[in-house]
């Protein structure tokens, strides 16, 4: 059986997806790897409703999402189309700011303290959210 019928322990179910909220920080790539090893991905926000759900759970804390432009254009980690999809950037963001003095610009997106999005240096150790879709994968075989 390969259908995920319910969320793993310590994950939160919402609208046919499972979400896991970290309580410590990692750089974006390390957070991405963590989610992959949970057979999940960094959260992909596809609607205002999902935005409010995630925002409610993370509170006013900088938190990575699965959106980056490290290879040029902005891309969601699961392949969801960025150009036609939901966006919730802060005013004048993303700005690929180089003034932070850490080298390079800002290539990874995160939720800010008010929930709106900002691009930031991918090495910053922010909290993160993993997401996996129900009925995509399963830990338990279905009952026959």
């Amino acid at each position: 059986g390969s259908e995920r019928t319910c969320c793993p322990v310590n994950w939160v179910e919402h609208e046919r997806s499972c979400y896991w909220f970290s309580r410590s920080g990692k750089a974006w790539a390390d957070a991405d790897n963590y989610c992959r090893l949970e057979d999940a991905h960094l959260v992909v926000v596809t609607s205002w409703e999902e935005q409010k759900f995630v925002q409610h759970h993370i509170g006013p804390v900088n938190t990575w999402m699965g959106l980056h432009d490290q290879n040029g254009p902005w891309k969601w980690v699961d392949g969801t189309d960025y150009e036609t999809g939901f966006k919730n950037w802060r005013p004048e963001q993303p700005d690929d700011w180089y003034g932070h003095g850490l080298g390079g610009g800002e290539d990874c997106a995160h939720f800010t303290d008010d929930g709106r999005w900002n691009d930031d240096v991918c090495q910053r150790p922010y909290r993160w959210v993993c997401e996996t879709e129900l009925d995509k994968a399963s830990q338990e075989p279905p009952l026959l």
Partner: antibody
């Protein structure tokens, strides 16, 4: 209480291959990432590879990348490490361990000796 | 790769002593650190995870502290079964790396 039992170690010539197995019991195997760690004789611990619970993602140490392949069969509660192009420096006790960050269950280890 | 450096490499102590082992990371790892105990011929045993959380079943004489780059494992009152090698391990960035080990010997 979870248990892990490795097998498949032995003596192999440089350039040869070996497949290690790790059979799990006492926990829901498919729920957890699994890891291989090795320890050369008289030396410290070295992380080798990790695989996600459903096998969709895996990562490797640079020292084994392209030579070793981690896999799992959740229907058999078994983790594998396929080791190709073995070198003398791969000689070690190989442990399987549960989870992706830190490892609460370990097997007893299986010794791999690469020598001509 | 993140280099984990333990000190001392060995320590001689007596039963009842307080023993402190330090682990330094070559870059900040927040609290992504674990401590293990290994006895000869045996697999390592998880003692502490997330820098300071005591693994279930581990005696409370073991404690961990620190964040960022500097971490400490303390054994408050050394017992005969505590003579072993202790390793730290970072889980911040791949590849996970271990310290070189600290051997706690009988004085």
């Amino acid at each position: 209480e979870g248990q892990l039992l490795e097998s498949g170690g032995g003596l192999v010539q440089p350039g040869g291959s070996l497949r290690l197995s790790c059979t799990a019991s006492g926990f829901t195997f498919s729920t957890f990432a699994m890891t291989w760690v090795r320890q050369a004789p008289g030396r410290g611990l070295e992380w080798v590879s990790v695989i996600s619970g459903r096998g969709g993602s895996s990562f490797y140490a640079d020292s084994v990348k392209g030579r070793f392949t981690i896999s799992r069969d959740n229907t058999k509660n078994t983790l594998y490490l396929q080791m190709n192009s073995l070198r003398a420096e791969d000689t070690a006790v190989y442990y399987c361990a549960k989870d992706q960050l830190w490892f609460d269950y370990w097997g007893q280890g299986t010794l791999v000796t690469v020598s001509s | 790769d993140i280099l984990m450096t333990q000190s001392p490499s060995s320590v001689s102590a007596s039963v009842g002593d307080r023993v402190t082992i330090t682990c330094r990371a070559s870059q900040g790892i927040i609290n992504w650190l674990a401590w293990y105990q290994q006895k000869p011929g045996k697999a390592p045993k998880l003692l502490i995870y997330a820098a300071s959380s005591l693994q279930s079943g581990v005696p409370s004489r073991f404690s961990g502290s620190g964040s960022g780059t500097d971490f400490t494992l303390t054994i408050s009152s050394l017992q005969p079964e505590d003579f072993a090698i202790y390793y730290c391990q970072q889980a911040n960035s791949f590849p996970w790396t271990f310290g070189q080990g600290t051997k706690v010997e009988i004085k």
